[in-house]
Interface confidence: low
């Protein structure tokens, strides 16, 4: 029991339990499909323990298997507009280093205004995750509608 209490005093990073929960900062210019994220206690219910944000993109600092999750809600959207603007798609992938570039998640909005998904995937130190939203509709910045995160699960 005493050992378990002592463990709780250690920072999350030292336990190898890297975790991040991010909220949308802004979208990129027209030819840049990436979503730009932000995180930190000053912003409310978002945080980074281990991973870092570089120019709004999430970079992994510890090798391991991660749970990656994302929810994106389109702003000013109804099922009618969503189907009319089809295809609007969201893709999450490793965008750098180039040698590890791969798509991890790909989702289409079809006739809905919100998509959410998660998966377990191995990630390595230095991997940068990009979230690409293609289509003409813009995402909501409401923190309970659009969010993105990773959680280290095991080596």
């Amino acid at each position: 029991q005493r050992f378990a209490q002592a463990q709780q005093q250690l920072p999350l990073e030292s336990l190898g339990w890297d975790v991040a929960e991010l909220q949308l900062n802004h979208t990129g210019p027209q030819q840049d499909p990436r979503l730009y994220w932000q995180g930190g206690p000053a912003l409310g219910r978002s945080f980074l323990h281990g991973p870092e944000l570089d120019k709004g993109q999430l970079r992994i600092h510890r090798d391991g298997i991660y749970m990656v999750h994302i929810q994106v809600t389109l702003a000013i959207c109804s099922s009618t507009t969503a189907s009319r603007h089809h295809p609007t798609t969201l893709a999450v992938g490793i965008c750098s280093p180039a040698s590890r570039s791969i798509s991890l998640l790909r989702l289409s909005f079809h006739q809905g205004c919100t998509i959410a998904s998660q998966r377990l995937t191995p990630l390595a130190r230095g991997d940068t995750l990009c979230t690409n939203l293609t289509g003409t509709l813009l995402p909501s910045r409401n923190t309970d509608e659009t969010f993105f995160g990773v959680q280290w699960v095991r080596p």
Partner: antibody
Amino acid sequence: QVQLQESGPGLVKPSQTLSLTCTVSGGSISSSSYYWGWIRQPPGKGLEWIGSIYHSGGTYFNPSLKSRVTISVDTSKNQFSLKLSSVTAADTAVYYCARHYEILTGYYPDVFDIWGQGTMVTVSS
Amino acid sequence: DIQMTQSPSSLSASVGDRVTITCRASQSISSYLNWYQQKPGKAPKLLIYAASNLQSGVSSRFSGSGSGTDFTLTISSLQPEDFATYYCQQSFSSPRTFGQGTKVEIK
């Protein structure tokens, strides 16, 4: 072509705030894929990145200076600005503004591809 | 922060010489490495981006190579206008950091 020009006082007293403005000509500060950055170079020394701003207002700072730095953008004037508070003699440097260009390839490298000519700022009483 | 270390700090060379400057990162930065040239009293000028790509308008006598932690800038045949200080810079991680510079002087 795009040109950058720094302006601001060349002499600032210790503990005061250094304020510089960079005016962009020959192109829009709102152009896609460009950040706008500040870099400084103390006399006889190397280059230090201070921070960069995206036209929408997203900012990225050097953590060693973050608590003292404010970078803002005024798209209507095609300008971006630097404020550095509580300056000391160690902040004496040539301050450069630069276009911080993110190349939209698969892995998004970025460069400082266009620079202003620099402005010398001395911190002294 | 990622530390960038250049060597040598200075070198003397003659016109026509082949000159190589090295830059080492304190951790792997993939190909996120840029090279700049700075002449006295002037702003730096971008030469090479993403380790090996020549910036538009820059002479082809400049070339860059490397990946991971070790990078080189090569000037194939030094010209009088190449006497300057050269800086490497990583764009892998914030904060963006520069090497301390290599001054190329006339022998």
